[in-house]
Interface confidence: medium
């Protein structure tokens, strides 16, 4: 079951996803989309970076930490209900089979009316970057090249959910999707 | 070296059946997944489906559901294309292909002719 | 499901530079790749994710995604990179191709 992380409505969100660099600067592509991890790549992509910078990002979403450092942790700004649900981070980290996903969902509660003004708490101050759940520590890498970023692992599970929710759905963007790198 | 050999053109009468067998080797077979693609003449490429040579799994894309279906022989690293009920319209070069970054790997294409 | 468009032909002078374009909404979300096939044989992926070469593929093709438009980029055009080009991404677990566009080297 996914991982859960709360935030208010008008706060921002921190959904975390680490990474080790096999060495300073060998960055490895990542991905973060709204919904399941799918078997490749993400689906709804809402920014990704590749071996270099963040090369396509929507407003609001954001790193907030150093990811040349492997934090690629998401901050969703000022949310509103509509932004909860499921986030995929996928961390394509070549080699056969060896992307690392992550699901982590977010709720969005109401936000509190409060008699006086206090310090806004978000995400960070809940969910202390230290204090990440299993699965969602480094990940080791070891080389980089032009290799598959293919995970078959997940391909029987979701393929039972795609007949659940009828495959014949045009396969959309949704959180039970396959897709491929 | 890594490569997909296909099996050889097949002509077809319409309703008839058709398996194209696709071997793979140089690298672990059951450590990517296989895809099918369609070429009609003339045409561009067209995706067909997907198979884990794990599980056996099967992703088909829209319009190659139910005539068409993906198998394997795990013991020689062998992925198969079934084609049943053949239509004119099947006629096409068929091509099985490693999904990577992007599809890396072809095989040399099986032409399939239906025609009466 | 995405929907891939590409022009279906494209001339360039020997020599020259050969820009093949792939249209598709928020393309620049998406990891492109890029195909080349000749006459009579199997394609062959000559970009992958956007701009990466695969090895043998000449550094003369170069590939970039942005906004709504990938590009493929052909400098010093040769009389061998006279082929089709097909554009794909991934969507929802099914491939999905562009219409294929016919590089004339004149």
């Known amino acids: 079951s996914e991982v859960e992380y709360r935030a208010e409505v008008g706060q921002n969100a921190y959904l975390p996803c680490f990474y080790t660099p096999a060495a300073p600067g060998n960055l490895v592509p990542v991905c973060w989309g709204k919904g399941a991890c799918p078997v490749f790549e993400c689906g709804n992509v809402v920014l990704r970076t590749d071996e270099r910078d963040v090369n396509y990002w929507t407003s609001r979403y954001w790193l907030n930490g150093d990811f040349r450092k492997g934090d690629v942790s998401l901050t969703i700004e000022n949310v509103t209900l509509a932004d909860s649900g499921i986030y995929c981070c996928r961390i394509q980290i070549p080699g056969i089979m060896n992307d690392e996903k992550f699901n982590l969902k977010l709720v969005i509660k109401p936000a509190k009316v409060t008699p006086a003004p206090t310090r806004q708490r978000d995400f960070t101050a809940a969910f202390p970057r230290m204090l990440t759940t299993r699965g969602h520590g480094p990940a080791e890498t070891q080389t980089l090249g032009s290799l598959p970023d293919i995970n078959l692992t997940q391909i029987s599970t979701l393929a039972n959910e795609l007949r659940d929710s009828r495959l014949a759905n045009d396969l959309r963007d949704s959180g039970a999707t396959i897709r491929i790198g | 070296q890594v490569q997909l050999v296909q099996s050889g053109s097949e002509l077809k009468k319409p309703g008839a059946s058709v398996k194209v067998s696709c071997k793979a080797s140089?690298?672990?077979?059951?450590?990517?997944?296989m895809t099918w693609v369609r070429q009609a003449p003339g045409q561009g490429l067209e995706w067909m489906g997907l198979?884990?040579?794990?599980?056996?799994?099967?992703i088909y894309a829209q319009g190659f559901t139910g005539r068409f279906v993906l198998s394997l022989d795990t013991s020689v690293s062998t992925a198969y294309l079934q084609i049943s009920s053949l239509k004119a319209e099947d006629t096409a070069i068929y091509y099985c292909?490693?999904?990577?970054?992007?599809?890396?790997?072809w095989g040399q294409g099986t032409t399939v002719t239906v025609s009466s | 499901q995405s929907v891939l468009t590409q022009p279906p032909s494209v001339s360039v002078a020997l020599g020259q530079t050969a820009r093949i374009t792939c249209g598709g909404n928020n393309i620049g979300s998406k990891n492109v790749h890029w195909y080349q096939q000749k006459p009579g044989q199997a394609p062959v992926l000559v970009i992958y994710?956007?701009?990466n070469r695969p090895s043998g593929i000449p550094e003369r093709f170069s590939g970039s995604n942005s906004g709504n438009t990938a590009t493929l980029t052909i400098s010093r055009a040769q009389a061998g990179d006279e082929a089709d080009y097909y554009c794909?991404?991934?969507?929802?677990?099914?491939?999905?191709f562009g219409g294929g566009t016919k590089l004339t080297v004149l």
């Open positions: 198979i884990n040579t794990k599980t056996g799994d099967t």
């Open positions: 140089g690298y672990t077979f059951n450590n990517y997944a």
């Open positions: 994710r956007d701009s």
């Open positions: 794909q991404v991934w969507d929802s677990s099914t491939g999905v």
């Open positions: 292909a490693r999904p990577t970054y992007g599809m890396d790997v």
